[in-house]
Structure formats: C-alpha cells, structure tokens
Amino acid sequence: PEPPTACREKQYLINSQCCSLCQPGQKLVSDCTEFTETECLPCGESEFLDTWNRETHCHQHKYCDPNLGLRVQQKGTSETDTICTCEEGWHCTSEACESCVLHRSCSPGFGVKQIATGVSDTICEPCPVGFFSNVSSAFEKCHPWTSCETKDLVVQQAGTNKTDVVCGPQDRLRA
C-alpha cells in the first residue's frame, strides 16, 4: 500500500507512517514504528502540556512572582498552565500577565467610567456638563451638580467639570 501523505486527527506523520500524538499532560519519548505504539511520558510536577502533541519536553508552569505584584489565580495542572493575576489595586501589563502596575487614578475633571480589574486598567472619562469630580480617584464617578432649585436655592456660582455649583438663598423682593 502507498505510504500515507496525511494522517487522522490526533496523529502525526513520521517516516511515512501515522503515529498517535501524546495526549495533554504527556510528552513524547519515542515515535511509533511498524511494530510499536508511540511512547509517551507524563509531565512531572510543575510541568504541563495543554494539547495533543509530539513535544519532547513539557513546559514549566508559570511562576506568579509576588515581587512583581503577581499572585496565583488558578493553579496549573499537568494539562494547564498556572494563571497569574495581580494583587488588589494592580493590573496586568500584558495579556500574558508577566508583571503588574498600579491602577491609574482619574484626575479632577474626570470620573471613573470602568473600575480596573486584575487584567485591565481604570478607564476614565471627562465629566460632561452638569457633572464634576474634584478628586483624583480610581473609584469615583463624575457626580451631578447639586440642584439648587430642589432646595429652594439659587445658583450663586456656576459649576465646572472640577467643582460643584454653589447654591445660595434667593434674593427677597423688597416691598
């Protein structure tokens, strides 16, 4: 019979022969032959392989280094890598989460549109007309200006994106 040019899923072609790939959590020790099956070996502690593979080395689990602000979100197994995230108040600098930076604060005149998570930074937005923020914060949204009318007061000083309006008493009509 003709030697195969392509193999089934979870197989690979070697020496004109289709050999079984090693399952996740195992690495390749020796290719199959006409007479023997593929020989695979489990990954050791702190190692993993997450796909059907023909790798001769397992990958080492990622180390979530506390010195870089990292902590373990999910422990690795023989089939999965460790997932790192950042300590409270910090977020990852990349998708791989290899280090962390402090969450950004929104300056006065800006409010928090989206609070930061372990993997994303704070998203700030400028306070629109009618709203203000007078603090630098990673949590505070823009606050609406005080409504003087509802307090039977009048605006004595207009608000800005950084300051609230100042209300005062209405001028009494003189007789």
């Epitope: 690495k27 020790v29 070996l41 489990p42 990954c43 050791g44 502690e45 702190s46 190692e47 397992c58 080492q60 689990h61 180390y63 979530c64 280094d65 506390p66 902590r71 373990v72 422990k75």
Partner: antibody
C-alpha cells in the same frame, strides 16, 4: 521575601506523637505543594510525601503511610506534619520544601530535629 | 516505585578538575532535580528541569540527560563545590531521591 520557618527541635519518648509545623511567608501556601523530607543522622534524603494546601490532597511514600499525617491551615499559611507511634528510627531532621520552581530557588525550611529516646 | 542510583557514591576532585555525577532511574522520568547540601544545612535546589541552574548557582555547573539517564557536571572544580549532591524525580509517586554523591576537594 520567601521563607519557610519550621518549629523547634523536639525530644520524644517511644510511642509518643509529635506535630511539627512549617510556616511560609512571601507567597500564599495554597498556591504551591508543600513536600516533607526526612534525613536520618548521617543518611541521605527521603521524600515522605506532599500536601496540596488548597484542598488538603496528600500523596505519601508507602513507607510513611500510617506514620506521617500532613495537614495545612491556609488561614495561617502553615503546613503541619504529625508523626505517630515514634520509634528510635524516627530520629531525624525533617524538612519542608516547596514546589521546585517557586522563584527558581525551591525554598526549604531550616529543618526540625526530632529525637526519639527513652 | 522509581529507584534512582547515583554514581559515584563518594569522590574527590582537585581544583580545576572536571567532575561528572550520574543519576540513573529504573524507568524514564520527565525531568531530574539536583540539590546541593553541606553539613549542618538545609539542601538547596541546584538544578531544576534537568538542565536549568537555580538562582545563584555558578555557571561552571550544568545538567543534562533524558529518559532514565541524567548527569550533573562541574566544568572546573572549586573548593566551595565540596558538598553532597542528590538527584530527585518528581514524575511518578512516590517521588524519590538518589542516595547522594559526596564530593570532596583534594
């Protein structure tokens, strides 16, 4: 800084029980396995077993099954090993150590000497 | 269980001499760890994942091997290298150590 600090030396009578502790700092104990290793006077290292502090899962060398009981308290970041029915052969230094890749140092405790003597 | 046999059990080397310590397993393992221990102190991780030097280990050390056969090499022996070296496998339970190789300086 990662540290594993073990409890102090113990002198016990044959038949007694001893519980030694290993308190970690610099990482959460639940994130990595804790291994226990025995070294009898003038002898080599013997792997006794390991615990996954996150769920309490343990693996023992059959030689130490029934002799050693490993536990962990994640609230205090402390692992414990209890040795029961002590005999003179249990006289040794006992070490706790982490998964090898923690900071690529594979940290070890300073060792706890257990002496069994009548 | 996997038995690890270290060779030699004891050896001495002169400063500058090349040293090779071997570790043979009764079955294939994924990797080997090497530990260095000096009298009265805790063991230290020396080589991990067969060939990676642990933090602070001098570059004159190297590790190699695969399957059931592994080795630790010191390219040029120095006085501070005198210690006992242990190999360990962490692939199959129960994890096991080799019997140790005591390396002395001549």
């Amino acid at each position: 800084e990662v540290q594993l600090v073990q409890s102090g030396a113990e002198v016990k009578k044959p038949g007694a029980t001893v519980k030694i502790s290993c308190t970690v700092s610099g990482f959460n104990i639940k994130d990595y396995y804790i291994h226990w290793v025995k070294q009898a006077p003038g002898k080599g290292l013997e792997w006794m077993g390991r615990i996954d502090p996150e769920d309490g899962d343990t693996k023992y060398d059959p030689k130490f099954q029934g002799k050693a009981t490993m536990t962990a308290d994640t609230s205090t970041d402390t692992a414990y090993m209890e040795l029961s029915s002590l005999r003179s052969e249990d006289t040794a230094v006992y070490y706790c150590t982490t998964s090898y890749y923690v900071g690529t140092y594979g940290y070890w405790g300073q060792g706890t000497t257990v002496t069994v003597s009548s | 269980q996997i038995v690890l046999t270290q060779s030699p059990t004891i050896m001495s080397a002169s400063p500058g001499e090349k040293v090779i310590i071997t570790c043979s397993a009764t079955s294939s393992v994924s990797y080997i760890l090497w530990f260095q221990q000096k009298p009265g102190t805790s063991p230290k991780l020396w080589i991990y994942s067969t060939s990676n030097l642990a933090s602070g280990v001098p570059a004159r050390f190297s590790g190699s091997g695969s399957g059931a056969s592994y080795s630790l090499t010191i390219s040029r022996m120095e006085a501070e290298d005198a210690a006992t070296y242990y190999c360990q496998q962490r692939t199959f339970y129960p994890y096991t150590f080799g019997g140790g190789t005591k390396l002395e300086i001549k």
